[in-house]
């Protein structure tokens, strides 16, 4: 499904993708939060920034995509498909697939989705901040 490996992307392209992901992550979180009475769980941690947090590998895209694909097995909000499509653009073609166990309990499913959606939204904020601060340093 990849047309170009991620290293062909310019920093400006990566920033556009991350901006779009940030916007989509906010939409997903807003919708997920409509389910009242669900609390964030400490049992799930979404990997976010890579150690150097430099383009093109600013975020752990393969792992993040794996978590979003797991959410997709549990929920059919179409914004999830769109998020996965954008994450695909940030992944090397030979990236290994991360395995995530799917919660089976109804309430735990909801907690998993809320927790990962919230962490994903925060991650996109961090990624964009890292990209913009890096761009400013490059111009000074």
């Amino acid at each position: 499904s990849h047309t170009l490996p991620v290293h062909f992307l310019q920093p400006s392209d990566i920033q556009k993708i991350v901006e779009e992901l940030q916007s989509l992550s906010k939409m997903l979180l807003k919708d997920v939060k409509e389910d009242k009475g669900v609390l964030v769980s400490q049992n799930y941690t979404l990997p976010c920034l890579t150690p150097d947090a430099q383009p093109p590998n600013i975020i752990h895209s393969p792992a993040i995509r794996a978590y979003l694909k797991t959410i997709r097995q549990l929920d059919n909000k179409s914004v999830i498909d769109e998020i996965i499509e954008h994450l695909d653009k940030l992944i090397f073609q030979d990236a290994p697939e991360t395995n995530i166990s799917v919660p089976t309990d109804t309430h735990e499913c909801k907690r998993f989705i809320l927790t990962i959606s919230q962490q994903f939204s925060e991650c996109m904020d961090l990624a964009l901040k890292s990209l913009t601060s890096g761009a400013q340093q490059a111009t000074t």
Partner: antibody, heavy 124, light 110 residues
């Protein structure tokens, strides 16, 4: 008691237009589901027309044959979804149902809800 | 284009018989599949959702199974009130699957 009530059906001439309404009662629109229109011609099977997501974005999915002539929309303040049908033909004669579907597998089957349907007859 | 192929289109059976209806998707639908029963002049009644979950109030003689592209509805012991038309349906909102109904299976008295 959650309910979906369709209205707006009736007799219309070929080439004419009709707007169907699907009013929700007993629940308010939220991001946990999709509302869809499905039709059933006399003696035939169920045919999906279009769905709209009730959430931060009004995502829509149309059956390929429905694009162009049929348009779905929603009014959250009225808890109502509409189906605008244009250039109607005799083969559009059917009972039109609106239905609510869960957006998640963790949701109970209460998220699957159907109206009783409204009959649309296209004839001169 | 996405398709759900249901078979058989009709079948005749007797009370007490075990009945099996299959539904095949043209691509994986990841268990986003429901089964309905419909009687003339009525809206469809949900029997099974998410491929295998029994809807509330539905007798345990109805069961669903399957994953990926192939799904089955089984009625373990057909009762007089079960003579009706049955439909499978996929209800995934994301763009990679879509929505649609099977062509239906009419179950009549032998």
């Amino acid at each position: 008691q959650s309910q979906l009530v369709e209205s707006g059906g009736g007799l219309v001439q070929p080439g004419g237009s009709l707007r169907l309404s699907c009013a929700a009662s007993g629940f308010s629109f939220s991001a946990n589901y999709w509302i869809c229109w499905v039709r059933q011609a006399p003696g035939k099977g169920l045919e999906w027309i279009v769905c709209i997501y009730i959430g931060s974005r009004a995502d829509t999915y149309y059956a390929p044959w429905a694009k162009g002539r049929f348009t779905i929309s929603k009014d959250n303040s009225k808890n109502t979804v509409y189906l605008q049908m244009n250039s109607l033909r005799a083969e559009d004669t059917a009972v039109y149902f609106c239905a609510r579907f869960s957006s998640g597998i963790y949701d109970l089957d209460r998220f699957f809800l159907w109206g009783q349907g409204t009959l649309v007859t296209v004839s001169s | 284009a996405f398709q759900l192929t249901q078979s058989p289109s009709s079948l005749s059976a007797s009370v007490g018989d075990r009945v099996t209806i299959t539904c095949q998707a043209s691509q994986s639908i990841e268990s986003w599949l429901a089964w309905y029963q419909q009687k003339p002049g009525k809206p469809p009644k949900l029997l099974i959702y998410q491929a295998s979950k029994l809807a509330s109030g539905v007798p345990s003689r109805f069961s669903g199974s399957g994953s990926g592209t192939d799904y089955t509805l089984t009625i373990s012991s057909l009762q007089p009130e079960d003579f009706a038309t049955y439909y499978c349906q996929t209800y995934y909102g994301g763009g990679h699957i879509g929505w649609g109904f099977g062509t239906g299976t009419k179950v009549t008295v032998l």
